[in-house]
Interface confidence: low
């Protein structure tokens, strides 16, 4: 099981580091988006795992971005963000069979409503129960 957990971490790490770099190969990204969306988590250990990913970096002074699957919809009251940015992208995450041609990326504003927990704990718990 320890070996499986390490292998999983390695796969996730590569997925995060290469997120959005190849629009033609998104299977791993979509799977990880689905994990974040379903487990209500963000990143592997922490949401900040996403902060250094090249494709997610913008040009602003604090241009941190995360996949939209990191957003906690139940905690977001801003209807503009919900309607125009997050919901159209997250609507694809409700089912496994979906197609996507570009990475779904959302900015992290100062008071963001992203999941605060990483996914490692939840995934490891799931592994232990199966």
């Amino acid at each position: 099981r320890a070996q499986l957990e390490r292998s999983l971490r390695d796969v996730v790490e590569k997925t995060i580091q290469k997120y959005g770099t190849n629009p033609e190969e998104t299977a791993a990204e979509e799977s990880w988006d689905y994990v974040q969306f379903q487990l209500r988590c963000c990143g592997w250990h922490y949401p900040q795992d996403w902060f250094q990913v090249l494709i997610l970096r913008g040009n602003g002074s604090e241009a941190h971005r995360v996949p939209c699957s990191c957003y906690n919809l139940s905690a977001t009251n801003d209807s503009t963000i919900l309607d125009k940015v997050i919901l159209p992208q997250l609507s694809r995450l409700g089912h496994l069979a979906r197609s996507r041609h570009s990475a779904d990326i959302c900015a992290v504003p100062a008071e963001s409503h992203i999941y605060r927990e990483g996914c490692a704990q939840g995934l490891q718990k799931w592994l232990h129960n199966n």
Partner: antibody, heavy 120, light 110 residues
């Protein structure tokens, strides 16, 4: 501009207290772990303390009980309260922003430092 | 607590030289290591995170490698701006928070 500016350093007698401040601009302090690192004159870097985004605090073994890290998110400012100061605490104290990456951390943004001199 | 040991403490080199600095951890820290560059009177500047990753703006002549207990910082072709002191940092935020810096390596002009 994204930057950190420390203040509060100066000359203090052994046994005395001092509170250092670190004002952040260009980013929201509340989103980050923040830490203090010190450097004695002519010596290397030494980790002091970190406060994470949720407010949990961590200290170097030697700093526990004497130093207290805190933050005021409304003022976007980090603090280090130093009590029972000793001559060996003489150093430049740097405030730094910590980023986390796969269970590791590093300091990606540093202040210019503030010098604390403990002497009678 | 983890102890980081850097070697050498001082290194004399010329512009264009290939320079290698090593850092040894007293226990396994996986890839949880960062490198910093510091010039006299200035704050440190971070060079490498997670053992081998270069942040934005750091020249590609800097390369980090290693995992577990042995790590290396290599400057492929030393430039005038590279004469400085370099520090490694163990940065493991696992079950117990651990942070420690190496003693530093001063790269000076030969």
């Amino acid at each position: 501009e994204v930057q950190l500016v420390e203040s509060g350093g100066g000359l203090v007698q052994p046994g005395g207290s001092l509170r250092l401040s670190c004002a952040a601009s260009g980013f929201s302090l509340s989103n980050y772990n923040m830490g203090w690192v010190r450097q004695a004159p002519g010596k290397g870097l030494e980790w002091v303390s970190v406060i994470d985004a949720s407010g949990t605090t961590y200290y170097a073994t030697w700093a526990k009980g004497r130093f207290t890290i805190s933050r005021d998110n409304s003022k976007n400012t980090l603090y280090l309260q130093m009590n029972s100061l000793r001559a060996e605490d003489t150093a430049t104290y740097y405030c730094a922003r910590e980023l986390l990456y796969f269970g590791s951390s590093y300091y990606d943004l540093w202040g210019q430092g503030t010098l604390v001199t403990v002497s009678s | 607590d983890v102890v980081m040991t850097q070697s050498p403490s001082t290194l004399s080199a010329s512009v264009g030289d290939r320079v290698t600095i090593t850092c040894q951890a007293s226990q396994n820290i996986d890839s949880n290591l960062a490198w910093y560059q510091q010039k006299p009177g200035k704050a440190p500047k971070f060079l490498i995170y997670y053992a081998s990753n270069l942040p934005f703006g750091v020249p590609s002549r800097f390369k980090g490698s290693g995992s577990g207990t042995e790590f290396t910082l290599t400057i492929s072709s030393l430039q005038p701006d590279d004469f400085a002191t370099y520090y490694c940092q163990c940065a493991d935020v696992g079950s117990t928070y651990v942070a420690a810096f190496g003693g530093g390596t001063k790269v000076e002009i030969k």
